[in-house]
């Protein structure tokens, strides 16, 4: 009979998790010469060490420190792109604008993007059946704590003008409870960051409203200004055209507004 397992509300560890993490690490270090020194086996050992044999509702940021140390990476000033509730477009953008970086363009974010993982207390097994759900089970689960840890570090190391892409189609364009609103905003360092520039991405083709006047954007401006960081906001009315113009800035249609 299979050993009794804690049943959580969330989906289990992503199939072939160890292999996936290692495959991604190898691929990343090959493509990024500045990370060639990274030993992927040590990265996997540190990743595993953060959650294996631990109760999956009692994970701390401290658990991930060995991994964070191994994955230390710096982004040039003015090149950090944060995002909230609009991951796909942010990633499409950095795939074209290769000198800008989201968290998922960095080693640790790249390793964990779209993956789920958890272990079990006192066993060396990975739980492929179920993992804690942030709402229904607990917030201090391996996945949530990982993203909180690496997001904090990513924000702390940002410098110059930091950009953030926000989803203008949502009821809360800026959400205080998102990772951006609860972690990244509060960990931007005023002595290193001169300004935060928000790009509000419009959803509807005919949407010509100025979403920079949205109350939640005003709330973001207030939080940022109180931290002695300047705030700017831009509407991106046509995200498709925006991406096209990043690819081909010389295109005549790109001289008009996007």
């Amino acid at each position: 009979l299979p050993r009794w397992r804690q049943q959580w509300s969330g989906s289990g560890t992503t199939s072939r998790f160890p292999e996936t993490v290692l495959a991604r690490c190898v691929k990343y270090t090959e493509v990024h010469p500045e990370m060639r020194h990274v030993d992927c086996q040590s990265v996997w050992d540190a990743f595993k060490g953060a959650f294996i044999s631990k109760y999956p509702c009692n994970i701390t940021e401290e658990d991930y420190q060995p991994l964070v140390k191994l994955g230390t990476q710096t982004v040039p000033c003015n090149k950090t792109l944060l995002w909230s509730r609009i991951k796909d477009l942010a990633h499409q953008f950095t795939q074209v604008q290769r000198d800008m970086f989201t968290l998922e363009d960095m080693l640790l974010g790249y390793l964990a993007d779209d993956l789920t993982w958890c272990g079990e207390f006192n066993t060396f097994e990975i739980n492929y059946q179920s993992c804690p759900d942030w709402r229904k089970d607990c917030s201090n689960n391996p996945v949530s704590v990982f993203w909180k840890t690496v997001s904090r570090r990513f924000a702390e190391t940002a410098c110059g003008v930091v950009h953030v892409m926000l989803n203008g189609s949502r009821s809360k364009i800026f959400d205080k409870n998102s990772t951006f609103g609860s972690v990244e905003v509060h960990n931007l360092q005023p002595e290193k960051v001169q300004a935060l520039e928000a790009w509000v991405i419009h959803g509807g083709r005919e949407d010509s409203r100025d979403l920079c006047q949205d109350p939640t954007i005003k709330e973001l401006e207030s939080i940022i200004s109180k931290r002695n960081i300047r705030f700017f906001c831009k509407n991106i009315y046509r995200p498709d055209k925006f991406l096209q113009c990043v690819k081909n800035p010389e295109d005549s249609s790109c001289l008009s507004g996007i």
């Epitope: 072939r16 292999e19 495959a23 190898v26 090959e30 030993d39 992927c40 086996q41 492929y128």
Partner: antibody, heavy 116, light 108 residues
Framework: QVQLVQSGAEVKKPGASVKVSCKVS????????IHWVRQAPGQGLEWMGG????????IYAQKFQGRVIMTEDTSTDTAYMEMNSLRSEDTAIYYC?????????WGQGTLVTVSS | EIILTQSPAILSLSPGERATLSCRAS???????LSWYQVKPGLAPRLLIY???TRATGIPVRFSGSGSGTDFSLTISSLQPEDCAVYYC?????????FGQGTRLEIK
Amino acid sequence: QVQLVQSGAEVKKPGASVKVSCKVSGYTLTEFSIHWVRQAPGQGLEWMGGFDPEDGETIYAQKFQGRVIMTEDTSTDTAYMEMNSLRSEDTAIYYCTTGRFFDWFWGQGTLVTVSS
Amino acid sequence: EIILTQSPAILSLSPGERATLSCRASQSVISRFLSWYQVKPGLAPRLLIYGASTRATGIPVRFSGSGSGTDFSLTISSLQPEDCAVYYCQQDSNLPITFGQGTRLEIK
């Protein structure tokens, strides 16, 4: 411990198909991918293909593309390798293997003889 | 595709002698993902070394691996009659996984 047990030897005629099974125990197919390797008489080891978790699909060596299908039944923890349009040069021992990036574990091998 | 080239193709030595087998990669291979196998007729490949230098479970200490980047080697410090086999290097850092063409070790 990890064990891979393969199906028995097969004798096939040219043009026929063969399906080799590989039952894993000591772990489940959700943990590690299966790869297939063959060794023809007097020849070296040749990787045929295997599951790439990063792309979420099976990658085949160019040589076997379109002629080999690798599948898995996670409910029984069994992997399968089916080869079509067999020819005499496909006579070989076929191995399933697992544990990429870690310690590789191998099945005992299945001898497939293609002869008219 | 990473091509692994082994040398020599055949090595003929006496018991007690030291054997050094070479494996050269067409591009840099992460050491952790370079393995060595021993293959005897009718038997499944036996993993000797993984991570370029770590002996697999149950492998005698006379087998050792070394190297990094594009040059790797397997050394058998004191040959035994049962070491007569074909030896293959393998890389699994990239798909397709590739093997060297093998070195046949003959014991005189």
